[in-house]
Amino acid sequence: LIIGFGISGRHSITVTTVASAGNIGEDGILSCTFEPDIKLSDIVIQWLKEGVLGLVHEFKEGKDELSEQDEMFRGRTAVFADQVIVGNASLRLKNVQLTDAGTYKCYIITSKGKGNANLEYKTGAFSMPEVNVDYNASSETLRCEAPRWFPQPTVVWASQVDQGANFSEVSNTSFELNSENVTMKVVSVLYNVTINNTYSCMIENDIAKATGDIKVTESEIKRRSHLQLLNSKAS
């Protein structure tokens, strides 16, 4: 969380942003809140990106003002207009690109004063892994697949029974470039698995960490997976 204060002639207002990550090809949110004003027409929101030749987005007098928007953001940005009055200046970014990564500034002017706060926005690709029993293999084998990752992640296997065991010798991980030539499909195979055990396939890069669990017993297979974004700090 980053909290910024204005320092100019009028009073300062508190602006709060949260560092976040965008999944390339999907829509993302750059979060920003501020002390609300009673009149929408008195609120100006400017989103800036470090080193960019124009504005990312501007909202003033109750509507978008995009005459100074930089070409790389044209047609891809929107604020939540109905929520501005309650202090939400968050920006929706459509079709996140790798090049959208960087430092952004949420700059607010209201009748109470001015304020701004920066946020770090990371971009990459991350997806939920799915772990299955590979019945085609000659021995008991698990196959962990995740369709989209970037940058290239690390893959680590763990087991509930053999806690702390190193499975690198009995696993094989491959990365296959997807058709858009940026993201990659992750496939990891774990050999010599035993029943009545829970295995976890953990995929991690500097943006996200995802885990796929599988519990194999004589009578059933249970799966669970979750994904966590890393470094979500508020300003």
Partner: antibody
Framework: EVQLLESGGGLVQPGGSLRLSCAAS????????MSWVRQAPGKGLEWVSA????????QYADSVKGRFTISRDNSKNTLYLQMNSLRAEDTAVYYC???????????????WGQGTLVTVSS | DIQLTQSPSTLSASVGDRVTITCRAS??????LAWFQQKPGKAPKLLIY???SLEGGVPSRFSGSGSGTEFTLTISSLQPDDFATYYC?????????FGQGTKVEIK
């Protein structure tokens, strides 16, 4: 200390090509847009081209559009200007300048190189 | 592209004079205007950005004002070091443009 050092100028024939470089130091290069500005002998300043910090956006003056290409290599802290189909009227001292960090909120053209002379003549 | 017109082209003044240079834009540029000083054989020096913000290290006798299409640079009391050529410059999301320059010379 911020420093910008241009190189690559010289004498070239009309229709020829030249590539200017600008080596930057003393600041986080990728955080700033960069520009090229030129000044013909005894004339005023003319902005030529600009490029965003990440290299994703570029701008050109109408007089050079389609002939000049601006680029940057952030790993080398270097700005470039590829000049093709050169004309006599392109003769000038070419400056690289540090452009904005934050559009509308920060200084721009606050640091300049010493300039490199490009002469287009047969 | 946006055109900038400076006036006058040349200005003769004496030390201690109050000097005003005008810059007009062909369309509204809000406050996206900077002022530069250039001396012969030297690179330009930034004086004012965002129409009225004084660059660090620049003497307070320099000031800028205006918004939209009309801008002014004022030197409240001209000093010997101030004889030079002054340029306005607009910046927006698709271009930058300089004015043609105003030469301030000794009367």
């Amino acid at each position: 200390e911020v420093q910008l050092l241009e190189s690559g100028g010289g004498l070239v024939q009309p229709g020829g090509s030249l590539r200017l470089s600008c080596a930057a130091s003393g600041f986080t290069f990728s955080s700033y847009a960069m520009s090229w500005v030129r000044q013909a002998p005894g004339k005023g300043l003319e902005w030529v081209s600009a490029i965003s910090g990440g290299g994703g956006s570029t701008q050109y003056a109408d007089s050079v559009k389609g002939r000049f290409t601006i680029s940057r290599d952030n790993s080398k802290n270097t700005l470039y200007l590829q000049m093709n189909s050169l004309r006599a009227e392109d003769t000038a001292v070419y400056y690289c300048a540090r452009d904005i960090q934050w559009f509308g909120e920060s200084t721009l053209f606050d640091y300049w190189g010493q300039g490199t002379l490009v002469t287009v003549s047969s | 592209d946006i055109q900038l017109t400076q006036s006058p082209s040349t200005l003769s003044a004496s030390v201690g004079d109050r000097v005003t240079i005008t810059c007009r834009a062909s369309q509204s540029i809000r406050s996206w205007l900077a002022w530069f000083q250039q001396k012969p054989g030297k690179a330009p020096k930034l004086l004012i950005y965002k129409a009225s913000s004084l660059e660090g290290g620049v003497p307070s006798r320099f000031s800028g004002s205006g918004s939209g299409t009309e801008f002014t640079l004022t030197i409240s009391s001209l000093q010997p070091d101030d004889f030079a050529t002054y340029y306005c410059q607009q910046y927006n999301s698709y271009s930058r443009t300089f004015g043609q320059g105003t030469k301030v010379e000794i009367k």
